[in-house]
Amino acid sequence: LRKVAHLTGKSNSRSMPLEWEDTYGIVLLSGVKYKKGGLVINETGLYFVYSKVYFRGQSCNNLPLSHKVYMRNSKYPQDLVMMEGKMMSYCTTGQMWARSSYLGAVFNLTSADHLYVNVSELSLVNFEESQTFFGLYKL
Amino acid sequence: LRKVAHLTGKSNSRSMPLEWEDTYGIVLLSGVKYKKGGLVINETGLYFVYSKVYFRGQSCNNLPLSHKVYMRNSKYPQDLVMMEGKMMSYCTTGQMWARSSYLGAVFNLTSADHLYVNVSELSLVNFEESQTFFGLYKL
Amino acid sequence: LRKVAHLTGKSNSRSMPLEWEDTYGIVLLSGVKYKKGGLVINETGLYFVYSKVYFRGQSCNNLPLSHKVYMRNSKYPQDLVMMEGKMMSYCTTGQMWARSSYLGAVFNLTSADHLYVNVSELSLVNFEESQTFFGLYKL
């Protein structure tokens, strides 16, 4: 079976890394495990990994925003940032604002790698399933 | 044959959903049909679906922008929004501006699903083939 | 072997097209050659091609930004722009700013095609490996 995941925003995320909806809606999870915010690889190989995060706020103060996909493996002491997007000075002060960050690329992943998504400001994330998501598939 | 599509912007249309160039230029259409703005799936399976829309205007008034990829199937009464990007407060009032929205993710699609792209303001879309496009491929 | 590439930003790029790190870090290069900034196709077929560029500056002056993936082949006199992103009026004058452009789509590529990435303003690109990259894989 094709190894694939598409997880969608979960609004009761309260800490980092982001947590994801892995059961209901347009979710896919096949040949990959989901554990505490992370996608757990169980077969070494090439994967296309992607994520989109939708940031929005009532009154713009241009708080710097970051969106990262990173990897953790017990063999390595430190997280590896695979992809990252940053935004600064992106809206007009005081205005209602909205903006997305999209990341997607190919990586060689190893069995037991855990992939996560991190954002700089959780309170500015909107978790609609069509707007904020995290996925991968094995090539 | 690989099921794949890459359609590019078609500027002489006024209708929603967006209509696409399916014949000339860097277009691809194989194992998938194009009908009235929609990509019609004829084989159930996993697909990576993507779209980019290039918005621009002569004088910024921060009109809210949205870009959606949605699915319609005669079995379901309502459209399903698969992916969406929104922008608000994205440019400096009165200035010439330009911005893109990119969406891409994996979905389990069923034979006879129709996929479309919608935008909130057609007048602000630029339809150059390299800038505005819609595609998919079966994994 | 799967034909795949993921190249990351190389900060000693001094001219166009952008040059890329093809050896160290999270780089992938298999069944595709890298030559003077370009990915060289050696097998005709369908490829998903992607690139992300991270632009940032100390003091916003809203210099128009463009990010292009283009193709060159000795059979054709002119470069073909495959994908492009443009930004205008994207930050508040005088402020420190940061913004990304992401492109990704499917193309039918021919043996000996050379793919490159071009940006409008090299001095505004940040070359961190997680932020600026260029890749493809054969479907």
Epitope: - | S13, R14, L63, P64, S120, E121, S123 | -
Partner: antibody, heavy 119, light 111 residues
Framework: QVQLVQSGAEVKKPGSSVKVSCKAS????????ISWVRQAPGQGLEWMGW????????QYNENFKGRVTITADKSTSTAYMELSSLRSEDTAVYFC????????????WGQGTLVTVSS | EIVMTQSPATLSVSPGERATLSCRAS??????????IHWYQQKPGQPPRLLIF???HLESGIPARFSGSGSGTEFTLTISSLQSEDFAVYYC?????????FGQGTKVEIK
């Protein structure tokens, strides 16, 4: 900058027709609708119809029962509104306005053309 | 067709005071994304000028003292502190469906 310049005032007899022009400049004529809106003396605004110069498609307010025809000439970036079977109650100022396709708000207006219908 | 009803027909306000204009649609002009209502100002002998679009968004070049709110069928245009140049007729317009229709207008006059 965006400009819409209309033709001059007209005096017409009942039963005749009038054709008002609206020349657009400062933007891509084929990417926006042109709408026509009229205003009778001392009255409110009434939308008559639109044309999309990109493909020539048009829509009309049924209140005008086939009396109105809106056309566009892409080569000169000019829109036209023709109203036939004129009656005294058609005396009004006729405005052309640029309209965004989807949002359908009128963000730029012509200066107006007074059409007087009198025997 | 959707009928737009504005109230009051005339509003007498002193300069510096707040003015609140209402517009009611005969059926909802909102979707899950936007409210398709726009406000215009018209002075004698001039064409209308767009002030607010999509219920609450300020058009480029319009002073921040103008604001719009509402959803569904009830909408409000507020002028926080009236200036002499604000005395005019104000129209709301919907664009939810065809035909586009305008309210009959509210005249804001000097008290």
């Amino acid at each position: 900058q965006v400009q819409l310049v209309q033709s001059g005032a007209e005096v017409k007899k009942p039963g005749s027709s009038v054709k008002v022009s609206c020349k657009a400049s400062g933007y891509t004529f084929t990417r926006f609708d042109i709408s026509w809106v009229r205003q009778a003396p001392g009255q409110g605004l009434e939308w008559m119809g639109w044309i999309f110069p990109g493909d020539g498609s048009s829509q009309y307010n049924e209140n005008f029962k086939g009396r109105v025809t809106i056309t566009a000439d892409k080569s000169t970036s000019t829109a036209y509104m023709e109203l036939s079977s004129l009656r005294s109650e058609d005396t009004a100022v006729y405005f052309c306005a640029r309209s965004l396709i989807s949002t359908a708000m009128f963000d730029h207006w012509g200066q107006g053309t007074l059409v007087t219908v009198s025997s | 067709e959707i009928v737009m009803t504005q109230s009051p027909a005339t509003l007498s306000v002193s300069p510096g005071e707040r003015a609140t204009l209402s517009c009611r649609a005969s059926k909802s002009v909102s979707t899950s994304d936007f409210s398709y209502i726009h406000w215009y100002q018209q002075k004698p002998g001039q064409p209308p000028r767009l002030l607010i679009f999509l219920a609450s968004h300020l058009e480029s070049g319009i002073p921040a003292r103008f604001s719009g709110s509402g959803s569904g069928t009830e909408f409000t245009l507020t002028i926080s502190s009236l200036q002499s140049e604000d005395f005019a007729v104000y129209y709301c317009q919907h664009s939810r469906e065809l035909p586009r229709t305008f309210g009959q207008g509210t005249k804001v006059e000097i008290k």
